[in-house]
Structures are given as C-alpha cells and as structure tokens.
C-alpha cells in the first residue's frame, strides 16, 4: 500500500509544477521574442547599414553627379539602379551626350572625371539607342582608337575589339593618320563610324555602368 | 544574408513553433476529454465542469485564431 | 504590399499566435496537473480544488503577461 | 617648316564684310590639324573666333555664330574668313594658326597677322 | 566658357630678377593650359603647353606648374629678351580663351 501524500507536499509539488510550466512558458515566449526582434531589428540595422553603405556611395559620386534618377530593378525593394540626372539609361549602362567640343584624350578625361569612359559599342541595339539622342550634323568621338597607326584598334575599357561588331562606313577606316573614331551621319548610309585625327575637337559620347544602390 | 530571407527564415522558425504547440495542445486537449470521460465513468461525473470548462476554452480559440 | 512588409506582418502574426498558444498549452498543463492531483481528494471537496485553481490559474495568467 | 600668311584688306567700311585669306605653305590643310582664326582687339584681348578641320568642317565661337564663315581653297592650300555686317567693334589684328599641337595644347604656328580697321 | 583672369596686369622688373605671373580658369581645365610671349608688332609664340611642358628652343630659365583652376609661369633671372606681353590660354573645351595679359616692363 502506496503511503497517502500529505496535502502540503501535494500543493509543494503542484507549486514546483506550476513553476517549472510557467518556467517553460516564460523561456518559449523570450524565444519567440528573440526571433521577432531579430527579425524586426535585424533587417531595420541591415536596411540602416545599407542606408550608410548607399549614402557613402552616392557621396563617391556627388562631386560631379549632384542628382541620381534611380529606378527599382525586379520587385526587391533593395535595388536600385542609377544613373546621373542628365544621363540616359540602356539596359545596365548610362550615356551622355558631351556637346563640348574637346580632342578624344580630353574628351575621355572629361568622361573619366565623371566616372565613366568614352562610349564602348558593343551591339547594334546599343548604337541603335544611342543614336536617337545625337544630332546628324555633329560628329562624337568613341572609346575606340588606335594608338600605334597599325590598324589594331582597342576600346578604353579593354573590350576586345570585334571586327564582326563594327559599324563602319563604308570605305572607312582610310588613313593611318587617322587614330581615332567618331559615330556621324551620312545620308548616304545613315549612322556609322569614321577614323579621324584625334586632336581635331568633337563632341563626345560617355557611357558608365548604372550605380547600383 | 539579405533582409527578406532573414525574415522568411523566422517565419519559418515561428510556423513550425506554431505547428508543433497546436499539435501539443491539441493531444493534450484529447487526453484532458478522454480523462474527463473515465473519470465521469468512475466519478459519477465529478469532472464533467472541468471538461465544459476547457471545451469553452477551445471553442475561444477557434474563434479567435488568426487567420492563416 | 510589397513582398517583405508582408512577410514582417507574417511574422507578427506567427508571433502573437505563438504566445498565445504557449500560454494556453502551460495553462492546459497545469489545469490537467491539478485536475489530476484534486482526483485524489475526498468527492465532496473536488470543487474546491477546482474553483481555487481556477482563481491561480487566472492570477498567473495575468503576472506572466508579457509586456506590449 | 609649316608657314602661315595672312591677306585682305586693311579697311573695311561699318555694315559691309571683311574677308581674310590664310595662305599655307610646308603643310597640306588636307593632311590634319585645324585651321584657326584668331584675332586681337587694340587693348590687347585676344580671341578665338573659330576653326576650319582638314576634313572640311568648321566650329565657331557662339558671339560670332551668325556672322561668321570660315571656307577653304584645297587646290591653293588656303582657307578664308568671311564676317559679315562689320562695327568699329571689329577693329582688331587678324592672325591664323594652326591649332592641335602638343595633344591640343597650344597654338605652335601663327600668321604675322593683319591689322583691320572698321571705319567710315 | 570658361574665363581666364590673369594678374598681374602690368609688372616692372629688373633684368636678373624672378618673376611671376598667375592665372586662374573659372572651372577645372586639368592642365591644358598654355603659355605665349609676345612682343609688340609680332605674333604670340608658345612657350609652355600643358601647364609644365616646355617648347623646344624655349629657355629653361622658364617654368610652368599648377593644377586644376590655378596656374603660374614662373620666370628665373629675367633677361633682356624677356620683355613683352605674356598671355595664358586653356585649351580644355572649345572656345578656348585667353587671359587678359600681363605686360612685363624693363625697371
């Protein structure tokens, strides 16, 4: 026969019970918590140190970009993509059109210090969009030339240059003096590139990838 | 990792936390209702308040649940 | 709504319902604790037993409130 | 040595156009470069008025756009000014010169220059 | 366009002294700036191109420097021959213009 437990001991054992529950409780809830904070705070830090990081980027670029036009890539509300205010954007790049009048050093000088190159064309869509925003009686010069006069033309960024995507004039490159290239117009043939001396001032075309923030 | 994966990552810990308590209690519920029947078998119905009790308490929360 | 704010809303929800339910499942546990334990008493005391739990249950309820 | 020369009259009456000639020698205007005209009013201030390139063609500064035409003679290896409805404003000492020396850093070869006097 | 202010506009020096004269471009030229003498009834000559780079012929006793939107031309133990008008000119974007003038007279 199982000795009968005395009611004190009995209400002593509910008590560390009841305790232990509440114990369990109290620990499940302050896990709970932890993870609803981490998920609260953690994305609100993450957003602030991408806010810091976005900031500091976008002071990389004030000097010479004082506005961004940014528009959200996909349906992440993280990325944006941008390109200075006057700039034009196509696919991942931004262009400008330079209606100075500069030789092609300083002309890609004066792209350099804006962050960017003289433009580098690398399909015909690309030329097909940038030419709906050049006047036909301008020349602008390109990220294309060649330095030595050996015909081995090279773009600034060190794409490799691919005769198959070319757009010359016809009977163009024609004279090994001429070390540079411009996109103009001709009636005859509509937009395409010529060789010409690169000291002689053009207008200039700019191109630099979209700033991601 | 990137904020919204974190966050789908929670969701996922407090789903399954969810799951696994409604299933806890649930069995516990069982077991409470099925102890409440033998003891009124045995008892002459000494449990039936606590079982009425505890069936309010879970109709409650039917109401009450938030709709997933 | 976009797809994270939607998902920070989840995450309330999961949350609530996940306190909720662990309160009620200790609550389930210590009732059927002292169900158990006020079985062993003599019949005409049963409800005592019942009615005093029922008052500790509802105190516990209200210090182990989490704050909002 | 490339040689520059320039030519026209040194009258020009208010209203009518003055036109300069820039005879080059020792290098063809066809060959590169751009062709320039510049000119220096009697306090001294200089002025780029605006080039013709070895291709043909031409920039011009914008205070003179719509007055101002530069041409050339491939054959004779000369290029021309032309600027119309001329003031007493005009007075100056028109020089040519090639421009695109040194990476486009500075006007290497100059004309001697002509004195032109706008008056009545 | 940018605009060339030159100072200063007149100097008076003595054969032997260093001289020299400044010229600041209203925005960044990045070097591209040149230096010309000239002497009355005469056509300007180059001296300097690119900020520091001296033409060939041109006496070392010259010397260009700066950077961004200030530039000097600096003249060591002047000589006779050094008399004259001297003019700065950027040639960073077309028009290219040139500064005042700095006439430097014999002391």
């Known amino acids: 026969m199982v000795p009968e437990e005395e009611p004190q001991d009995r209400e002593k054992g509910l008590w560390w019970f009841q305790l232990k529950v509440w114990s369990m409780a109290v620990v499940s809830i302050l896990l709970l918590s932890v993870c609803f904070t981490v998920s609260s705070v953690v994305p609100h830090n993450f957003m602030y140190s991408k806010t810091v990081k976005r900031l500091s980027k976008l002071r990389e670029y004030q000097q010479y970009h004082p506005s961004l036009t940014c528009v959200m890539e996909g349906k992440d509300i993280e990325d944006w993509s941008c390109c200075p205010t006057p700039w034009t954007s196509f696919q991942s790049s931004c262009y400008f059109i330079s209606t100075g009048m500069q030789s092609w050093t300083k002309s890609q000088k004066n792209c350099s210090v804006m962050g960017a190159d003289l433009v580098v064309i690398n399909t015909r869509e690309e030329q097909d969009f940038i030419i709906q925003n050049l006047k036909r009686n301008s020349s602008y010069f390109l990220g294309l030339s060649d330095p030595g006069g050996r015909r081995h033309w090279q773009w600034v960024d060190q794409t490799p240059y691919n005769e198959n995507v070319t757009f010359w004039h016809s009977g163009e490159p024609n004279n090994l003096d001429e070390r540079c290239a411009i996109i103009n117009f001709r009636s005859s043939e509509e937009w395409g590139w010529n060789d010409i001396h690169c000291h002689v001032p053009q207008k200039s075309i700019c191109k630099m990838k979209k700033i991601y923030i | 990792l990137g904020e919204p994966q974190l966050c789908y990552i929670l969701d996922a810990i407090l789903f399954l936390y969810g799951i696994v308590l409604t299933l806890l209690y649930c069995r516990l519920k069982i077991q409470v209702r099925k102890a409440a029947i033998t003891s009124y078998e045995k008892s002459d119905g000494v449990y039936t308040g606590l079982s009425t009790r505890n069936q309010e308490t879970y109709e409650t929360l039917k109401h009450e649940k938030p709709p997933q | 709504l976009g797809e994270p704010q939607l998902c920070y809303i989840l995450d309330a929800i999961l949350f609530l319902y996940g306190i909720v339910l662990t309160l009620l499942y200790c609550r389930l546990k210590i009732q059927v604790r002292k169900a158990a334990i006020t079985s062993y008493e003599k019949s005409d005391g049963v409800y005592t037993g019942l009615s005093t739990r029922n008052q500790e249950t509802y105190e516990t309820l209200k210090h182990e409130k989490p704050p909002q | 040595d490339v040689q520059l020369q320039e030519s026209g009259p040194g009258l020009v009456k208010p209203s009518q156009s003055l036109s300069l000639t820039c005879s080059v020698t020792?290098?063809?205007?066809?060959?590169?470069?751009?062709w320039n005209w510049i000119r220096q009013f009697p306090g001294n201030k200089l002025e780029c008025m605006g080039y013709?390139?070895?291709?043909?063609?031409?920039n011009y500064n914008p205070s003179l756009k719509d007055r101002i035409s530069i041409t050339r003679d491939t054959s004779k290896n000369q290029f021309f000014l032309k600027l119309n409805s001329v003031t007493t404003e005009d007075t100056a000492t028109y020089y040519c010169?090639?421009?695109?020396?040194?990476?486009?850093?500075?006007?290497?070869?100059w004309g001697h220059g002509t004195l032109v006097t706008v008056s009545a | 366009d940018i605009q060339m202010t030159q100072s200063p506009v007149s100097l008076s020096a003595s054969v032997g002294e260093t001289v020299t004269i400044t010229c600041r471009a209203s925005g960044n030229i990045h070097n591209y700036l040149a230096w010309y003498q000239q002497k009355q009834g005469k056509s300007p000559q180059l001296l300097v191109y690119?900020?520091?780079s001296l033409v060939d012929g041109v006496p070392s006793r010259f010397s260009g420097s700066g950077s961004g939107t200030q530039y000097s031309l600096k003249i060591n133990s002047l000589q006779p021959e050094d008399f004259g008008s001297y003019y700065c000119?950027?040639?960073?974007?077309?028009?290219?213009?040139f500064g005042g003038g700095t006439k430097l007279e014999i002391k």
């Open positions: 010169a090639r421009g695109g020396d040194y990476d486009d850093g500075g006007f290497a070869y």
């Open positions: 020792g290098y063809s205007i066809t060959s590169g470069y751009y």
């Open positions: 690119n900020a520091k």
């Open positions: 013709i390139t070895y291709d043909g063609s031409n």
């Open positions: 000119q950027h040639f960073w974007i077309i028009p290219y213009t």
